[in-house]
Amino acid sequence: ALLPAREATQFLRPRQRRAFQVFEEAKQGHLERECVEELCSREEAREVFENDPETDYFYPRYLDCINKYGSPYTKNSGFATCVQNLPDQCTPNPCDRKGTQACQDLMGNFFCLCKAGWGGRLCDKDVNECSQENGGCLQICHNKPGSFHCSCHSGFELSSDGRTCQDIDECADSEACGEARCKNLPGSYSCLCDEGFAYSSQEKACRDVDECLQGRCEQVCVNSPGSYTCHCDGRGGLKLSQDMDTCEDILPCVPFSVAKSVKSLYLGRMFSGTPVIRLRFKRLQPTRLVAEFDFRTFDPEGILLFAGGHQDSTWIVLALRAGRLELQLRYNGVGRVTSSGPVINHGMWQTISVEELARNLVIKVNRDAVMKIAVAGDLFQPERGLYHLNLTVGGIPFHEKDLVQPINPRLDGCMRSWNWLNGEDTTIQETVKVNTRMQCFSVTERGSFYPGSGFAFYSLDYMRTPLDVGTESTWEVEVVAHIRPAADTGVLFALWAPDLRAVPLSVALVDYHSTKKLKKQLVVLAVEHTALALMEIKVCDGQEHVVTVSLRDGEATLEVDGTRGQSEVSAAQLQERLAVLERHLRSPVLTFAGGLPDVPVTSAPVTAFYRGCMTLEVNRRLLDLDEAAYKHSDITAHSCPPVEPAAA
């Protein structure tokens, strides 16, 4: 059997000492004679010890004994004991009591023989058994003074050999995870929850994680059981990015030919119906009105121009009603209305002129007279020696109710090559040149254009009292939207409850599925923030699509191009949502087209403005944007630019 070097040395040393034992005893007798009974010199002491180390150790101490107890001749017993103990360096014992097995006296020295687990010259140093091969322990080795023991990590127990460890199966205890799923792991276990939930060790249950506290969303975050959704400021032109957390700009995906003509004047800019141009003509010389211009529109009704004095004096208004020219005139307080000529709201350019002759007014379309009206008086009215005429374009300088026959003054039309009173007009041209909002789209088609920066709203009623039902009110919302979108996100149609600041109903384009967190181009039908139905749509193909929505008591359908959408709610949820909608419809609601007012982004799945062409039919009635309670001035009510032709 092989022993470690240290143990071998300790084992050999005592044997070596025993060989000298006879000499030690002889030396003790010799010391008695020479130095205890007699007084000895250093040389005599050297003869006793026969070596210098022990002599050098002994002699100074021998002299100390003499100083302390007197010379040998005084026969003081203390002296004899003092001298006899000097050669034994184990008295008093210099070795550590705890760690020493025995002390051996050496020549002027001593040797401490250590117990197992101890080391050092005095056997006072603990030997760290764990420093070599972890003391033979599989996991944890604990060093102790003079000893060591093995232990295991949490979740393991020590085997009977005192060295190896085995895993404890905590899941064997059914209470380990409470409501959560338990999974045993080497030395441990894990309580598992579904995604979006986290284990609560105190409650021993799965609790919803509020991801919103982790700042995952760039803008607005809404937590939900096991999940969360991010929302972006749609009204600010933002939508969710691919990662469903950050926001990005809503960019046009279909290029529309929105180029404008600097030599054109757009008449539909002022939704208020106020004129787009006001001109004051003043002459010393009596003058007659001559106005000529090229005109283009799809709008059936609106005011082209007004010429004359104040509302109670003499004036004419050239307007459009049912697509034909109408002339309203008031001369010295007497009003008349005349309508004649072809339908001119076909969207093509034509030349229109108004000429005041000596006793009549002549209206021409493409140089052909369509109206000739006898008048008694002049449009230029004398005042303080000067003749005055006010001319306004695209509106009248007073309220439309003060016309001979009320008309909706708003006219989505375009003028070019205008000539007022045979004079060149630099003022309007200069103004139009620097103001793009006063210019028309170079090319237009039928429809209404929503530029992605505003909405229109109406005050419509969705409750009805059928004759066969007596007084019981029922409700219905049926929307048909013909759309040619330019961007993939935006509100097509919505209802807003101003009192509650809620969005009872919305139909919108969206480019992701919020619950599946999946990017996909969809039309969403929602009541408040809950999607009732979704339907895929090829939104960026530049084609016209028909979105049909029908909601009534007990049913809600969404169709895109004749294909029915997928329901997102259970039958019970649908009934609950429709009840919410009906409650809203019993209170005042506003009907929005192309966007929403400033509502929280969480009010509806989409809050962004729609960009593209759209015509809306609500409950089988075509919505005319000129009839809206409000329309953003950049929305063109009766014209839409075409899709830009693809580059060759």
Epitope: R280, F281, K282, R283, L284, Q285, P286, T287, R384, G385, L386, L421, N422, G423, E424
Partner: antibody, heavy 116, light 107 residues
Framework: QIQLVQSGPELKKPGETVKISCRAS????????MNWVKQAPGKGLKWMGW????????TYTEEFKGRFAFSLETSATTAYLQINDLKNEDTATYFC?????????WGQGTLITVSA | ETTVTQSPASLSVATGEKVTIRCITS??????MNWYQQKPGEPPKLLIS???TLRPGVPSRFSSSGYGTDFVFTIENTLSEDVADYYC?????????FGAGTKLELK
């Protein structure tokens, strides 16, 4: 473009007569009346009156009634200012200006100097 | 006859300074006031017409305000090229009347 071109400067003796012309181009002459404005050296502007280019009827301000006459040659699209019995105080630059209730288009001016 | 009183008769400013000229009328003329600039040897140039309307091509440093009988013409950040005589003209009633003029010089 619209232009009003006046005749050149004249040096006259007191008691003489002068006739200044103002030729219009770039617009229908009869659609706008023609005004005349006087500016004495180092002094301000004074409206003298106007002439109806349709009827030829002149209108003078009080100060310029009597020795002053506005006339037309419609075929030549020209207006005239004649000053009879010139006086030293008639020394001035005379401008024609198209009637628009105010004056946008002006002739370059004709300096008449009356000196013995 | 509506008389027009223009002030000051002359003023001297450094370039970049603001100029204010005032015209007061003897009768209420609504906003039928016009403002002209005349440089030596040239006819007057219409800067602002009735209704405080800046004429096409006239720099935006020129502006006017007023209604009734009190009217103000302003040049913001005067330039050396603005040295000229300035006149107001009322076109509310016949006879048309000019202000006496303001001579603008540079310091």
């Amino acid at each position: 473009q619209i232009q009003l071109v006046q005749s050149g400067p004249e040096l006259k003796k007191p008691g003489e007569t002068v006739k200044i012309s103002c030729r219009a181009s770039g617009y229908t002459f009869t659609n706008y009346g023609m005004n005349w404005v006087k500016q004495a050296p180092g002094k301000g502007l004074k409206w003298m009156g106007w002439i109806n280019t349709n009827t030829g009827e002149p209108t003078y301000t009080e100060e310029f009634k009597g020795r002053f006459a506005f006339s037309l040659e419609t075929s030549a699209t020209t207006a005239y200012l004649q000053i009879n019995d010139l006086k030293n105080e008639d020394t001035a630059t005379y401008f024609c200006a198209r009637d628009e209730g105010w004056f946008v288009y002006w002739g370059q001016g004709t300096l008449i100097t009356v000196s013995a | 006859e509506t008389t027009v009183t223009q002030s000051p008769a002359s003023l001297s400013v450094a370039t970049g300074e603001k100029v204010t000229i005032r015209c007061i009328t003897s009768t209420d003329i609504d906003d039928d006031m016009n403002w002209y600039q005349q440089k030596p040897g040239e006819p007057p140039k219409l800067l602002i017409s009735e209704g405080n309307t800046l004429r096409p091509g006239v720099p935006s440093r020129f502006s006017s305000s007023g209604y009734g009988t009190d009217f103000v013409f302003t040049i913001e950040n005067t330039l050396s090229e603005d040295v000229a005589d300035y006149y107001c003209l009322q076109t509310d009633s016949v006879p048309l009347t000019f202000g006496a003029g303001t001579k603008l010089e540079l310091k």
